[in-house]
């Protein structure tokens, strides 16, 4: 039950995380105009990975896409790549993890296959989360560098456009969304990997041996043991089938009563 809960929770946390990574990637507020010197401005600038926007006091908002690839800074391209890789890995991870969920029965899929799929999706989520965190951090570093360069009366290039010293940019909401989402995806991935350890069937089982003690006709049938799990003693009652030991809840798995988001 704990394994199912860990796996289910890992899936849900990763799902939220990946949704957050997608949201962050699409958001326009990766960098926003620094209002330190002018807290009330009639024209407010903000930029995303794909376009830059201007919101006027009138409420009119104008966004312009970066319709160039070669003219964009390499760092921005790298951030885009990291976020897209994170999304793709996360999406594949989600697809794999759906089939790996213990509470979902698909044909006669072996527990070992589910364990492998859980581990695969977990690793994918971890890498996805790391990609998102790395992407957001690279962008944040780029912002900090440009901020101090523009403060020092230099011209900085962001999004293929020239920014004069008048407009300095600071962290936008998308950065925080990205950091949190990346973290959640990472945590979800770790949970999936932990769940995998509990899902893996007992690999090395000892054949049942009958010991005849003198004067007694009692047969000792020790249950099988997991090979080098290091997770403490196996205290559950065992049923023995062809010398292989499985816990009672592994013989027949029922869908658990969870609601899936």
């Amino acid at each position: 039950m704990a394994v199912t809960a860990c796996q289910g929770l890992g899936f849900v946390v990763s799902l939220i995380g990946i949704a957050g990574i997608i949201a962050a990637t699409c958001m326009d507020q990766w960098s926003t105009q620094d209002l330190y010197n002018n807290p009330v401005t009639a024209v407010f600038n903000y930029q995303g990975l794909w376009r830059s926007c201007v919101r006027e006091s009138s409420g009119f908002t104008e966004c312009r896409g970066y319709f160039t690839l070669l003219g964009l800074p390499a760092m921005l391209q790298a951030v885009r790549a990291l976020m897209i890789v994170g999304i793709v890995l996360g999406a594949i991870g989600l697809l794999v993890s759906i089939f790996a969920l213990k509470c979902i029965r698909i044909g006669s899929m072996e527990d070992s296959a589910k364990a492998n799929m859980t581990l695969t999706s977990g690793i994918m989520f971890i890498v996805s989360g790391l990609c998102a965190i790395a992407g957001v951090s690279v962008f944040a570093n780029m912002l900090v560098t440009n901020f101090w360069m523009s403060t020092a009366n230099m011209y900085t290039g962001m999004g293929g456009m020239v920014q004069t010293v008048q407009t300095r940019y600071t962290f936008g909401a998308a950065l925080f969304v990205g950091w949190v989402a990346g973290g959640l995806t990472l945590i979800g991935g770790v949970m999936m990997c932990i769940a995998c350890r509990g899902l893996a069937p007992e690999e090395t089982n000892y054949k049942a041996v009958s010991y005849h003690a003198s004067g007694h006709s009692v047969a000792y049938k020790p249950g099988g043991f997991k090979a080098s799990t290091g997770f403490g003693s196996n205290t559950k009652n065992k049923k023995i089938y062809d010398g292989g030991a499985r816990t009672e809840d592994e013989v027949q798995s029922y869908p658990s009563k969870h609601d899936y988001v």
Partner: antibody
Framework: QVQLVQSGAEVKKPGASVKLSCKAS????????INWVKQKTGQGLEWIGE????????YYSEKFRGRATLTADKSISTAYMELSSLRSEDTAVYFC???????????WDQGTTVTVSS | DIVMTQSPSSLAVSLGEMATINCKSS????????????LTWYQQKPGQPPKLLIY???TRESGVPDRFSGSGSGTDFTLTISSLQAEDVAVYYC?????????FGQGTKLERK
């Protein structure tokens, strides 16, 4: 079509207050920002402030901050400007205008004349 | 505050001739985010409210005759009337629409010669 209609002319004594209204029609009232502009007879235009009817946010020119109060009543699509502690130099025509693209004021009312005289 | 200075303060031009009004701002009105200049031109006739002519320094408002054109960038701007018509006699104002407080030029009175 978009229309702004202001209240009638006002004659006030120094030290008194005046509250001007600007009723909007022909558009969704909360969609556009309303600005107030002062013009003394034969002189130029002077920006007083603006109000964002949706959230009620207001911005004022430093010269009018504390004396001018901008409000809006969404239920009757009307913006108000109250000017307190009136002095003779407040005698002018007051316009309300809608702020549109480019932060440009593209619809103006006909103006309300306020006369401050003892 | 951004100070807007118009020149000349008055201008007399013959009908059919070109009229040019200049406007200078104390700070740049160019927004780097969209590369637009937040300068607006208005026309005001006696007894009437101002009428919007041009926004973003060069974008003509719908319904404004094409003889009116705006140009310039940063701090220096120009309103040009290519061929003066009798109905163009008015006072013209430039306005900073980039930063609070919005400030207007003192106005240029355009008369027919």
């Amino acid at each position: 079509q978009v229309q702004l209609v202001q209240s009638g002319a006002e004659v006030k004594k120094p030290g008194a207050s005046v509250k001007l209204s600007c009723k909007a029609s022909g558009y969704t009232f909360t969609s556009y920002v309303i600005n107030w502009v002062k013009q003394k007879t034969g002189q130029g235009l002077e920006w007083i402030g603006e109000i964002h009817p949706r959230g009620g946010n207001t911005y004022y020119s430093e010269k009018f901050r504390g004396r001018a109060t901008l409000t809006a009543d969404k239920s009757i699509s009307t913006a108000y400007m109250e000017l307190s502690s009136l002095r003779s130099e407040d005698t002018a025509v007051y316009f309300c205008a809608i702020l549109r693209r480019g932060n440009a004021m593209d619809y103006w009312d006909q103006g309300t004349t306020v006369t401050v005289s003892s | 505050d951004i100070v807007m200075t118009q020149s000349p303060s008055s201008l007399a031009v013959s009908l059919g001739e070109m009229a040019t009004i200049n406007c200078k701002s104390s700070q740049s009105l160019l927004n780097s985010g969209n590369q637009r200049n937040y300068l607006t031109w208005y026309q005001q006739k006696p007894g009437q409210p101002p009428k919007l002519l041009i926004y973003w320094a060069s974008t003509r408002e719908s319904g404004v005759p094409d003889r009116f054109s705006g140009s310039g960038s940063g701090t220096d701007f120009t309103l040009t009337i290519s061929s003066l018509q009798a109905e163009d006699v008015a006072v013209y104002y430039c306005q900073n629409s980039y930063n609070y407080p919005y400030t207007f030029g003192q106005g240029t009175k355009l008369e027919r010669k």
